[in-house]
Interface confidence: medium
């Protein structure tokens, strides 16, 4: 089927368009182009007879049209009036006619737009500003940019007038920005120069600096005032309500007690017509007063609270000193002094931080000390301890248990047997016990001030038979080649033999294994990772025998010399480098990397994307085991071959 394709479809004024003919039939006599959607002799542009290769202009010919032997029509130097439909009339040799219609649209090349504004100096929180993009152009799309970004979503921003007008309601100082508009049509796009919005605001409440309010007689008083404002504020100072001067700074040399009083700074914005004031009260001392300590927390809770102790009063140009337990301050990461030394902060207080604390003010001849302050640190209760430590009793004896937990204020105690409350006392006494008194004995300690509770449970067995023993250890995480471990078989019982097994075998002969305390204690000297085995103890007498559950020793070791994988040392430019480091260690070590001595990330895997010869060098993996306190490292050299595509990666 005969079709017309316009190339391009959207044409800029002054450019050219080609009406391209597709599927032109064979055996043609000639063809004619017409302006419009039908064949109309009055609107003929040009005709062409194939036999003579003769082109004949028609009434609508403008001199800008060229017809080609393949029937395509080129129109040059396009004008707005050229928009519309064009019809090709084909006359075949058999005099059967065929027609096809195509079209194109003409758009003007857009001029550079500009922004007009209805308010060049809007006032914050009061005025609205309407920006309009000029000129108004038909068939154009309008876009807006703020600081070269597209418009943010905001209820204060509104587009209207076909997006040609941008209105900012209730402007704020944050609307001070670069605004641009852009016009677009299918053939061109133009952006305006930027317009900077100048929002008038303030003054905000002024701030007076420095913040000190106490001074000594003879010092200079130098106060500065600042308030955010556009245009910048004009400042005035008043002392006790009396105007002093119109400056941003107030300077009074060699002050006396008579200079004590209220100092007011007034900030004024001549454009917005607004005034704001701030008052500070200045005290001038003839001599430094006796200092005293204030605390932001009189009953801090251990491991929870921080306490800030402040030495009062605040006096300009004064040296503050502190003592704890009648000693100068110890070096501790939990003790922090403010820049002027006036505030001592104890981070995460402990029960050992009670004090006493004293502060002092240095004067010309001596140091004035405050009265001592003692902190009442609330702590505990710690895990209560139940004594005596026996867990195995014979029938007929008296059971007397005592409970104690470190706590401030002192703990309140309760006893439970098999979960049932017995009494609210520190001691529990049961006479002439029987096997029915076997069970779980719980001591509960409660601190009413901190609200914390802790419990300890002890299993009491009353039996003529031996109980199942258990193993206690003096070191649950010993370090290889350094620590010793003492295992003790519980409970302690009279006329009893103690036995030991390792991994189900009787004890091997070794100078590092030692039995003591009637074979009840097994000590391993200089543990190694191979000692991480299952240990079982047994007790036996003439009536019965029993074995403990196994206890597996968790030996901390390493880190051993690390291994970097993959082993490759040469890479191609553009590859991603992915090095993994591994070291035998318990617990798992912390990994870090250095490249040519420069610290990198603290990860087991080092990843660098798109390496180049600049990545050549030494890659060191460092491993550290915080539990053993040991470190190790290994270094690997990496070579990167240059890219074949100079000067680098193409995009």
């Amino acid at each position: 089927k005969l079709t017309i394709e316009s190339t391009p479809f959207n044409v800029a004024e002054g450019k050219e368009v080609l009406l391209l003919v597709h599927n032109l039939p064979q055996h043609l006599f000639g063809y004619s182009w017409y302006k419009g959607e039908r064949v109309d002799g009055n609107r003929q542009i040009i005709g062409y007879v194939i036999g003579t290769q003769q082109a004949t202009p028609g009434p609508a010919y403008s001199g800008r049209e060229i017809i080609y032997p393949n029937a395509s029509l080129l129109i040059q130097n396009i004008i707005q009036n050229d928009t519309g439909f064009y019809t090709l009339h084909v006359i075949k040799s058999d005099l059967v006619n065929e027609e096809a219609t195509g079209q194109f649209r003409v758009y003007p090349e857009l001029p550079k737009p500009s922004i007009s504004s209805n308010n060049s100096k809007p006032v914050e929180d009061k005025d609205a500003v309407a920006f309009t993009c000029e000129p108004e152009t038909q068939d154009a799309t309008y876009l807006w940019w703020v600081n070269n970004q597209s418009l943010p979503v905001s209820p204060r921003l509104q587009l209207s007038n076909g997006n040609r007008t941008l209105t900012l309601f209730n402007v704020t100082r944050n609307d001070t920005a670069s605004y641009k508009c852009e016009t677009q049509n299918p053939v061109s796009a133009r952006r305006s120069d930027s317009v900077i919005l100048n929002v008038l605001y303030g003054p905000d409440a002024p701030t007076i600096s420095p913040l000190n309010t106490s001074y000594r007689s003879g010092e200079n008083l130098n106060l500065s005032c600042h308030a955010a404002s556009n245009p910048p504020a004009q400042y005035s100072w008043f002392v006790n309500g009396t105007f002093q001067q119109s400056t941003q700074e107030l300077f009074i040399p060699n002050i006396t007690v008579n200079n004590s009083g209220s100092y007011t700074c007034q900030a004024h914005n001549s454009d917005t017509g607004l005034n704001r004031t701030t008052v500070t009260t200045i005290t001038v001392y003839a001599e430094p007063p006796k200092p005293f300590i204030t605390s932001n927390n009189s009953n801090p809770v251990e491991d929870e609270d921080a306490v800030a102790l402040t030495c009062e009063p605040e006096i300009q140009n004064t040296t503050y000193l502190w003592w704890v337990n009648n000693q100068s301050l110890p070096v501790s990461p939990r003790l922090q002094l403010s820049n002027d030394n006036r505030t001592l902060t104890l981070l995460s207080v402990t029960r050992n931080d009670v004090g006493p604390y004293e502060c002092g003010i240095q004067n010309k001849l001596s140091v004035d000390h405050s009265d001592p302050v003692i902190l009442n640190v609330l702590y505990g209760p710690d895990d209560p301890t139940i004594s005596p430590s026996y867990t195995y009793y014979r029938p007929g004896v008296n059971l007397s248990l005592s409970c104690h937990a470190a706590s401030n204020p002192p703990a309140q105690y309760s006893w439970l047997i098999d979960g049932n409350i017995q009494q609210h006392t520190q001691e529990l006494f049961i006479s002439n016990i029987t096997e029915k008194n076997s069970g779980l004995y719980t001591c509960q300690a409660n601190n009413s001030a901190s609200g914390h509770s802790r419990t300890t449970v002890k299993t009491i067995t009353v039996s003529a038979e031996l109980p199942k023993p258990s193993i206690s250890s003096n070191n649950s995480k010993p370090v290889e080649d350094k620590d010793a471990v003492a295992f003790t078989c519980e409970p302690e019982a009279q006329n009893t033999t103690y036995l030991w097994w390792v991994n189900g075998q009787s004890l091997p002969v070794s100078p590092r294994l030692q039995l003591s305390n009637g074979n009840r204690t097994l000590t391993l000297f200089n543990v190694t990772r191979n000692d991480a085995r299952a240990y079982v103890c047994g007790i036996q007498n003439s009536v019965s025998a029993n074995r403990s559950d196994p206890v597996t020793l968790d030996v901390l070791y390493g880190p051993d010399t690390p291994i970097i994988s993959p082993p490759d040392s040469s890479y191609l430019s553009g590859a991603n480098l992915n090095l993994s480091c591994h070291s035998a260690s318990n617990p798992s070590p912390q990994y870090s990397w250095r490249i040519n001595g420069i610290p990198q990330q603290h990860t087991q895997v080092l990843f660098i994307a798109k390496i180049t010869p600049n990545n050549n060098g030494t890659y060191a993996c460092f491993v550290s085991n915080l539990a053993t306190g040991r470190n190790n490292s290994i270094v690997k050299s990496i070579t990167v071959s240059a890219s074949g595509t100079s000067p680098g990666l193409s995009a």
Epitope: D568, S569, S570, Y571, L572, S573, G574, A575, N576, L577, N578, A609, K610, S641, A642, S643, G644, T645, L649, S650, A651
Partner: antibody, heavy 120, light 106 residues
């Protein structure tokens, strides 16, 4: 499992261009480099270059520089290789390969190949 | 560009034979990969980084070498091993392949 499925055979005239596609499945195309290797009839293998689908970075063999363009559309997990200004000696089977970004640039997954014939 | 020369270019052998194919690089390379290709099929990775067996490849295939000289060895030829074998270097752009060794049944 990893699969690379390439577009069908093409016949082109000298001077024309050809664009071969390679659809990946069974892995995230952004995690790999896509390489292209060709093999002329009865001849050996010839590496053409790679593209990083994550950001469009490329590395081309100098022989093909200026004639080859490698692109990807990660939304449909497809890589493309376009070779322009074709000559008769460009007649070959073109393979796409998946390669790990960390080197060592060996090819364990290959497309089935696309035969491009250049003939007047 | 690193040139890769494979030898021999073709060789005849019998089932059960031990076969060695050599690949020589025009300058030193760090690693070599080896591929097997059967007619009408895409190549298949056999050995990567000189000596590592690719997944699913029988243990009768092995690789060795360093610097400029590398070898692929088939310890005991099986009927399915008759194919063309290519080496490939990965140390310098452009990546280059050897010209191939065609292994035929004697």
């Amino acid at each position: 499992q990893v699969q690379l499925v390439q577009s069908g055979a093409e016949v082109k005239k000298p001077g024309a261009s050809v664009k071969v596609s390679c659809k990946a499945s069974g892995f995230n195309i952004k995690d790999s480099y896509m390489h292209w290797v060709r093999q002329a009839p009865g001849q050996g293998l010839e590496w053409m270059g790679w593209i990083d689908p994550e950001n469009g970075d490329t590395e081309y063999a100098p022989k093909f520089q200026g004639r080859v363009t490698m692109t990807t559309d990660t939304s449909i997990s497809t890589a493309y290789m376009e070779l322009s200004r074709l000559r008769s000696d460009d007649t070959a089977v073109y393979y796409c390969n998946e390669g790990t970004p960390t080197g060592p640039y060996y090819f364990d997954y290959w497309g089935q190949g696309t035969l491009v014939t250049v003939s007047s | 560009e690193i040139q890769m020369t494979q030898s021999p270019s073709s060789l005849s052998a019998s089932v059960g034979d031990r076969v060695t194919i050599t690949c020589r690089a025009s300058s030193s390379v760090s690693y070599m990969h080896w591929y097997q290709q059967k007619p009408g099929k895409a190549p298949k990775l056999l050995i990567y980084s000189t000596s590592n067996l690719a997944s699913g490849v029988p243990s009768r295939f092995s690789g060795s070498g360093s610097g400029t000289d590398f070898t692929l060895t088939i310890s005991s030829l099986q009927p399915e091993d008759f194919a063309t074998y290519y080496c490939q270097q990965r140390s310098s752009y452009p990546l280059t392949f050897g010209g191939g060794t065609k292994l035929e049944i004697k």
